[in-house]
């Protein structure tokens, strides 16, 4: 018997830093978890320990924190080279900054391999990209080798910006024929490596013949065997396992989001490469495992560029954004229109041509919004202001919903209106009228939606059959502020880019802003 | 663009040792194997072994077990063939390969370096 | 060790005929065979990989075909600059082996 150790991670998002319990800015460093100089203590200790060690990524280490924003995926190459990654898989976020702000900062400078065996280049791309990432790999660990196969969300189109000139085939479809080479090859041991979510890696230990494990990431799924260690509930057991089509049993891991947790599975195969036992769990990155020296160093001296950049303009405004609790828990407010305006624009994607766009619908949680920006500050907006109006380090994700689950949480907005709670809900692409004289849960009198299926954008009455797609806080998709609704009947869920990285980008482009109370959200005569 | 760059021609003594290296530039000398081939005069092919600058790694060819010597220094994005215990048929041009896929034929190859041991 | 048997060892043909290398290798190897071509003090050049696959730039005169044990390589119409030595190269098992090569010359 052969015994392997993987460790892996999944959905860091620009965690470089060490963070909070909730993944958000560290405030009290006695308390606070993961970060990349934590995790390599973690990961040298076990690789001094243990013989046949491997670390992966999963992908959608970009995009989450003003790292990020400064660095855009150079300070991805330089960690992950720093931590001595073995291998990552592709992710959507990854194709954020477009194909070049993958090409340049990550896929020229990893030392390490970067897999994706479903995205295919075609036209002038296929050229400039060759070879800079790759449909598996064989890895060669201690005297045996072991076969990695890549894959990425086939939704990254939607998602992210690949562009083009790049292809996104059927997961499933795209592994097979990899993995028979590395069979061919007589590498019989396999892990599939990628980024499509919980749901597709169970659907590839099942399907895919020949794979061995799979590393996922995307869905940020928190797997764990015994009491979990911090506030993530386990939605199963660590590995997970899955039956295949063919009788095997295929270990399935995640490691949840944010560098958190250090995934650890430990694979014994026998001399054919079967699977004869695998066990593990994630292993909380807290401040009981210190953070190397030499590591926090660097990124001690690469965080000075970041507080730079947070008093930089990022564009003016004109007018006053009111972004006060007293109108955006209570009625239509221009900074609510403004984040909508920035979620939708982050979201363009012109990828059929019967649609203007696949997404045309924002929701934001009035609550969400922290503060106003003063325009009498010759209309300076700075990331430091957005830092103010979005302090929680959320992300705009995108949702498929059902027109009925909508109007629940249109209903839900308004349900106790009155009281400055956080429901109240901002939007973009919609135009609501509530009439507060009724009783709660019957309050929304018209609910019209922006097509999506049209040349000419114009606004329909809600239909309660149809699925629709929107952009909201991943806090609402998540059932906070009450909207159990919006967690318990997505259809989709897909974790989108940081929220003030939205607002920002789409400031700079827009250099002057001047958003309007324009009557997306209006009360009927008499009930306000 | 991808380039292997061999070092010069040797003549070694029976019983010497032998040291080729291959520079290599224009991809991320960690993230590919570097392969060592011979060739004897008007002979065919052989393959000697390969490297994985990613973690060092090495396999041999059976027959070059304990006689051949695969290293790599990353900061030099560079790989080394040591070749010990020479004798007259290991008189040959050497060379260093590169894969576009793992072990699916070396797509590019160094200009050779040639070995003569005589004495 | 696997075996590669080329035939023929030697082959006289004219500028446009169709040429057909033949590699039989001594046991199954599947799709693991590589072809390759060398001219006179050059290093060898990757024609094609995974049996069928033509690497970048290789003109698409050049053909792989087979699977397990008898492979092919095919030149559809020779032109003046295939005159060569062609090899081909099993990657299934190690050692790793080249076949003894087929010398193709001006007719």
């Known amino acids: 018997a052969w015994e392997l150790t993987i460790l892996h991670t999944n959905d860091v998002h620009s965690r470089l830093e060490q963070t909070s319990e909730d993944s958000s800015k560290c405030v009290n460093a006695s308390r606070c978890m993961g970060g990349v100089a934590r995790l390599f203590t973690k990961v040298q200790q076990i690789r001094r320990a243990e013989p046949n060690v491997l670390l992966l990524d999963a992908g959608d280490q970009y995009q989450g924190t003003i790292w990020f924003t400064v660095y855009k995926g150079a300070e991805v190459a330089h960690f992950m080279n720093a931590l001595r990654y073995d291998a990552m898989a592709l992710g959507n976020h990854e194709f954020d900054n477009g194909v070049e702000g993958l090409i340049e900062p990550l896929l020229k400078e990893a030392k390490f391999p970067i897999l994706s065996a479903n995205i295919k280049a075609k036209g002038p791309l296929a050229s400039q990209i060759s070879g800079l990432y790759l449909p598996y790999k064989v890895l060669p660990v201690g005297d045996e080798v072991v076969g990695i196969v890549g894959y990425t969300s086939k939704e990254t189109p939607f998602l992210s910006n690949p562009g083009t000139n790049l292809v996104f085939e059927d997961e499933i479809t795209a592994l097979q024929p990899e993995v028979d080479k590395l069979k061919t090859l007589n590498v019989n041991k396999i892990i599939a490596l990628g980024h499509s979510g919980f749901e597709m890696d169970k659907l590839i230990a099942q399907k895919v013949r020949g794979v061995d494990v799979v590393v996922g990431g995307h869905s940020n799924t928190f797997l764990y065997t015994g009491n979990p260690p911090s506030k993530e509930v386990p939605a199963g057991k660590y590995p997970f396992i899955v039956t295949s089509d063919d009788g095997r049993k295929v270990p399935v891991v995640q490691a949840y989001a944010f560098g958190k947790y250090l995934g650890y599975l430990k694979i014994e195969f026998d001399e054919r490469g079967n699977v004869i036992s695998s066990h593990g769990n994630p292993i909380l990155l807290n401040s009981s495992i210190p953070e190397d020296p030499s590591i926090k160093a660097d990124i001690n001296k690469w965080r000075i560029k970041l507080d730079n950049y947070s008093t930089q303009e990022l564009g003016k405004t004109i007018v006053y954004l009111d972004g006060s609790s007293q109108s955006c828990r209570f009625r239509e407010c221009n900074m609510g229109n403004l984040i909508c305006d920035a979620m939708i624009n982050n979201n363009l994607r012109h990828t059929d041509e019967m649609f203007w766009n696949h997404v045309s619908m924002c929701i934001l949680n009035g609550g969400g919004i922290r503060s106003p920006i003063d325009e009498r500050n010759n209309g300076t907006i700075t990331w430091e202001n957005l830092a103010a109006v979005l302090p929680f380090g959320g992300t705009f994700d995108l949702v498929q919903l059902k027109g009925s689950t909508l109007k629940k949480a249109f209903e839900h907005s308004v349900h106790r209106y009155g009281q400055s709670t956080g429901e109240f809900l901002q939007v973009g692409g919609i135009h609501v009228v509530y009439d507060l004289s009724r009783k709660p849960g019957d309050r929304v009198v018209k609910l019209d939606v922006l097509c999506t299926k049209c040349r000419v954008p114009s606004y329909d009455p809600l239909k309660m059959d149809e699925v629709y797609k929107v952009i909201l806080p991943n806090f609402l998709a998540n059932g906070g502020d009450g909207f159990q609704m919006i967690k318990d009947e997505l259809l989709r869920h897909d974790s989108g880019d940081q929220d003030i990285n939205v607002v920002s980008t789409y400031i700079s482009k827009m250099k002057v802003i001047y958003p309007a109370v324009e009557g997306r959200i209006k009360f009927s005569t008499g009930s306000h | 663009q991808v380039q292997l760059v061999q070092s010069g021609a040797e003549v070694k003594k029976p019983g010497a040792s032998v040291k080729v290296s291959c520079k290599t530039s224009g991809y991320t000398f960690t993230r590919y194997y570097i392969y060592w081939v011979r060739q004897a005069p008007g002979q065919g092919l052989e393959w000697i072994g390969w490297?994985?600058?990613?973690?060092?790694?090495?396999k041999y060819n059976e027959k070059f077990k304990g006689r051949a010597t695969l290293t790599a220094d990353t900061s030099a994005s560079t790989a080394y063939m040591e070749l010990s215990s020479l004798r007259s048929e290991d008189t040959a041009v050497y060379y260093c390969a590169r894969d576009v896929y793992d072990y699916a034929g070396f797509a590019y190859w160094g200009q050779g370096t040639l070995v003569t041991v005589s004495s | 060790d696997i075996q590669l048997t080329q035939s023929p060892s030697f082959l006289s043909a004219s500028v446009g005929d169709r040429v057909t290398i033949t590699c039989k290798a001594s046991q199954g190897v599947a799709t693991a065979v590589a072809w390759y071509q060398q001219k006179p003090g050059q290093s060898p050049k990757l024609l094609i990989y995974?049996?069928?696959t033509r690497h970048t730039g290789v003109p698409d005169r050049f053909s792989g075909s087979g699977s397990g044990t008898e492979f092919t390589l095919t030149i559809s119409s020779l032109q003046p600059e295939d005159f060569a030595t062609y090899y081909c190269?099993?990657?299934?098992?190690?050692?790793?082996?080249f076949g003894q090569g087929t010398k193709v010359e001006i007719k």
């Open positions: 490297i994985y600058p990613g973690n060092f790694n090495t």
């Open positions: 190269q099993q990657y299934s098992s190690y050692p790793w082996t």
């Open positions: 995974w049996a069928s």
